[in-house]
């Protein structure tokens, strides 16, 4: 079941999935001046069996100016450096995302991919929040959101993160302590399309049980 809405938006924060549940779709979007090849897939789909999950279909972009040329999906290592890529660095995660049953890793980039990835999430997907560059967490409760099905409708739980500019008049008396697994709270909102994530930051984020770090390179 696809989630009806985007994960919640937090001022000066952005979110990221550590792994993608089976059923997740990623639009095959191309950057300006490029388009999907005629016979190309509209989206990649996370599929799998009990032991292994992977992305079906491949996204391929071609120059809008040329009709017949198709480019390879897998970029060369030096090309990868100049793209916007999400490099997952989560050494302290309880479960390695690659081995999480029923989940796919972040798909590798394809050549001439759009700068923003548009995911269609499914029920059960969890995303993690962090403050964008230049901001830090004034408050961080459970800094994740999960797409849940309630009374036949999907909704995202609310992440508890308040980001403040480093130049603002905040007082940070001490480092944050490890986050314990939280109890729930009544939802004030039953919200709950298509999700865009554009990570162009380098910062630290606390997941529910452990601290995990993910970075992205500037394009």
């Amino acid at each position: 079941e696809l989630c009806d809405d985007d994960p919640p938006e937090i001022p000066h924060a952005t979110f990221k999935a550590m792994a993608y549940k089976e059923g997740t779709m990623l639009n095959c979007e191309c950057k300006r001046g490029f388009r999907r090849i005629k016979s190309g897939s509209l989206y990649m789909l996370c599929t799998g069996n009990s032991s292994h999950s992977s992305w079906d279909n491949q996204c391929q972009c071609t120059s809008s100016a040329t009709r017949n040329t198709t480019k390879q999906v897998t970029p060369q290592p030096e090309e990868q450096k100049e793209r916007k890529t999400t490099e997952m660095q989560s050494p302290m995660q309880p479960v390695d995302q690659a081995s999480l049953p029923g989940h796919c890793r972040e798909p590798p980039p394809w050549e001439n991919e759009a700068t923003e990835r548009i995911y269609h999430f499914v029920v059960g997907q969890m995303v993690y929040y962090q403050c964008v560059q230049g901001y830090r967490a004034l408050h961080r409760g459970p800094a994740e959101s999960v797409c849940k099905m309630t009374h036949g409708k999907t909704r995202w739980t609310q992440p508890q993160l308040i980001c403040t500019g480093e130049m603002e008049t905040s007082q940070f008396p001490g480092e944050e302590k490890p986050q314990a697994s939280p109890e729930g709270r009544p939802e004030s909102e039953t919200s709950c399309l298509v999700t865009t994530t554009d990570f162009q930051i380098q910062t630290e984020m606390a997941a529910t049980m452990e601290t995990s770090i993910f970075t992205t390179e500037y394009q």
């Epitope: 919640p8 938006e9 937090i10 001022p11 967490a137 004034l138 408050h139 961080r140 409760g141 459970p142 609310q158 992440p159 508890q160 993160l161 308040i162 403040t164 500019g165 603002e168 008049t169 905040s170 007082q171 940070f172 008396p173 001490g174 944050e176 302590k177 986050q179 939280p182 109890e183 709270r185 009544p186 004030s188």
Partner: antibody
Framework: EVQLVQSGAEVKKPGATVKISCKVS????????MHWVQQAPGKGLEWMGV????????NYNQKFKGRVTITADTSTDTAYMELSSLRSEDTAVYYC???????????WGQGTLVTVSS | DIQMTQSPSSLSASVGDRVTITCKAS??????LSWFQQKPGKAPKTLIY???RLVSGVPSRFSGSGSGQDYTLTISSLQPEDMATYYC?????????FGQGTKLEIK
């Protein structure tokens, strides 16, 4: 059921200090930040500051020029707002309110009237 | 600090009327704006957040719109129970700032 219960009305003399409490129940106290809002009689709302109940971080409205201190006691699930060097224009109702994820102030205390009079 | 200029400061309208209240921020607040309703002697209640998202349980006659610096609260068909003071709030940057309020009276 989520509840924020504030301490009772106070009458203070100019120059004095008042400390208002806000006891919460119905959710995990350290998950949600706590804000304080001032409302003078017949006037609008003024944000005073916020505390992270999780780590004690604070952010204050400089309009109150260092006179406000917000604290939290996780052992009693209670937040406090202390306002010092009181003057007559501090006569107001003070509210505590939780910040809930992507919008602030979903749950409010009932308000505490502080009267500053000589 | 971000200034929020709310207008009108008061208005009188009849039951069934369409009512609009506006808020202008002194800078772009990227739609991080809430609308509150406050009745005498009561704490404020959130109606709208993120400029246009209705809080669960709030009647659908309330709606919000706007982006950048300019925002609007609309009551599509005024009801007697809507008599209250309405405030906007920006929560894009600290310190959070409220509009001055709009007192809505029923003719």
């Amino acid at each position: 059921e989520v509840q924020l219960v504030q301490s009772g009305a106070e009458v203070k003399k100019p120059g004095a200090t008042v400390k208002i409490s806000c006891k919460v129940s119905g959710y995990t106290f350290t998950d949600y930040a706590m804000h304080w809002v001032q409302q003078a009689p017949g006037k609008g709302l003024e944000w005073m500051g916020v505390i992270s109940t999780y780590n004690g971080n604070t952010n204050y409205n400089q309009k109150f020029k260092g006179r406000v201190t917000i604290t939290a006691d996780t052992s009693t699930d209670t937040a406090y707002m202390e306002l010092s060097s009181l003057r007559s224009e501090d006569t107001a109702v003070y509210y505590c309110a939780t910040s809930y994820g992507n919008y602030p102030f979903d749950y409010w205390g009932q308000g505490t009237l502080v009267t500053v009079s000589s | 600090d971000i200034q929020m200029t709310q207008s009108p400061s008061s208005l009188s309208a009849s039951v069934g009327d369409r009512v609009t209240i506006t808020c202008k921020a002194s800078q772009d607040i990227t739609s991080y704006l809430s609308w509150f309703q406050q009745k005498p002697g009561k704490a404020p209640k959130t109606l709208i957040y993120r400029a246009n998202r209705l809080v669960s349980g709030v009647p659908s006659r309330f709606s919000g719109s706007g982006s950048g610096q300019d925002y609007t609260l609309t009551i599509s068909s005024l009801q007697p129970e809507d008599m209250a003071t309405y405030y906007c709030l920006q929560y894009d940057e600290f310190p959070y700032t409220f509009g001055q309020g709009t007192k809505l009276e029923i003719k």
